[in-house]
Interface confidence: medium
């Protein structure tokens, strides 16, 4: 028998760590499964935003270009719409995702900078101005939300919320990478995380999640957009790799 479960491989069944994990999982449920993308925009330059009415220019990293954000949102929405098949049944992200406010709010948790814009192209494009000046746009909203991610009103002229569609805040250090100090606007990468429910001693539910993850991996592996460099991982990725190595051995 080939063991490919990382937990079985790297911790002894009677070890303290394993016993504590077992206790935790049994009483509180296992920690979420995570599906994650790290996205860079290698062909895009950083750009400068001039705040209204005055103030220092603010540089914005390549992935925070409006066109790149729209393309990343297209990718994110496409991932949300991935379907898998398990036991002749369709499995969607909605079936397996973490929706913390369910049943009142059934939206999946998506930890993404685009959730500052409620994962909406039209909110991302929301701007206020006249022919002289854009008084507020996605730059203004982003700069506000990274400081107050739980806000329901960005207090700019847009008055848009920062709260994610799942009902919770999106912390900037979870969705951005490559920035210095707390200058999130200098980010060189976007991180998108889809937390998925994990199950204790429920093989069928677990396999439904794994079936969806398999389709997620296939989809992202074959996703073509020359403007984006995408690194990705799914919860099952380590085990998949162990399987691959075992097969080749």
């Amino acid at each position: 028998r080939v063991t490919t479960n990382p937990v079985d491989l790297w911790s002894a069944p009677s070890s303290q760590a394993r016993l504590e994990k077992e206790y935790f999982d049994q009483h509180f449920g296992p920690f979420f499964r995570t599906e994650q993308l790290i996205i860079r925009a290698p062909l895009t330059d950083k750009h400068i935003y001039q705040p209204y009415p005055s103030g220092a220019d603010v540089p914005f990293g390549p992935p925070l270009d409006i066109q790149i954000l729209h393309q990343v949102l297209d990718l994110q929405i496409a991932i949300e719409n991935i379907t898998a098949s398990y036991d002749n049944e369709t499995v969607t992200l909605q079936d397996i995702c973490l929706a913390p406010l369910s049943p009142y709010n059934t939206n999946c948790t998506i930890l993404s900078v685009l959730n500052y814009f409620q994962n909406s192209h039209s909110v991302l494009d929301h701007k206020k101005g006249d022919d002289f000046f854009v008084y507020a746009d996605y730059h203004t909203h982003f700069l506000y939300c990274v400081r107050a991610p739980a806000s329901l009103n960005d207090t700019s002229l847009l008055h848009d919320p920062c709260l994610g569609t799942f009902g919770g805040p999106v912390f900037p250090w979870l969705v951005l990478g490559g920035y210095d100090d707390q200058n999130y606007n200098n980010a060189t990468a976007l991180v998108i995380t889809f937390p998925v429910n994990n199950y204790y001693n429920d093989t069928e539910k677990l396999q439904r999640a794994q079936a969806w993850e398999k389709e997620f991996i296939n989809f992202v592996k074959n996703y073509k957009n020359p403007n984006l460099t995408i690194s990705f991982t799914a919860e099952r990725s380590i085990e998949d790799e162990l399987n691959r190595e075992s097969d080749s051995d």
Partner: antibody, heavy 112, light 107 residues
Amino acid sequence: EVQLQQSGAELVKPGASVKLSCTASGFNIKDTYMHWVKQRPEQGLEWIGRIDPANGNTEYDTKFQGKATITADTSSNTAYLQLSSLTSEDTAVYYCSRGYYWGRGTTLTVSS
Amino acid sequence: DIQMTQSPASLSASVGETVTITCRASENIYSYLAWYQQKQGKSPQLLVYNAKTLVEAVPSRFSGSGSGTQFSLKINSLQPEDFGTYYCQHHYGSPWTFGGGTKLEIK
């Protein structure tokens, strides 16, 4: 192509009210501010006020508070200027504007 | 409210001459100043905004300068179509305020 189409000339009696319209094409008024400007015969330009059509928020020059009411209907992409208790002082051309783009103006004549 | 004072109120010049119109703001408006040209019976036409940004299709003989409280519009080599009334206007938030206008006439 961006255009601001204003309603036709008005001749009204003193004391009456009038509502002028400005219909936008080529853009969505929700994305911008719509301004109204007054120009009396042979005089300069006076800013009346502006509206944010997305939420109906308005700002007026203190001189026009109580005189002018600016509204917008996003479904018809139209901004309106209502003037009340009209006097001869209100005889003027009224323009709607975004800054670069201006309507052709509506001539309002207040006369008995 | 910010007051805009424009000078001169009127100006006579000949085709080919260079003229300068000035505008003073009662407080700092950074570079948020626009210049318009208006011909009799027509809507104002934007020439310059942000003090010195020339609107596309406006001839390069027009130029804006200044920041803070002092601004000017310069017209090099006047052409017959340049005659009309010029207004400065601040666009630093609201309310917009216009200068009193400068009537440029042919000498």
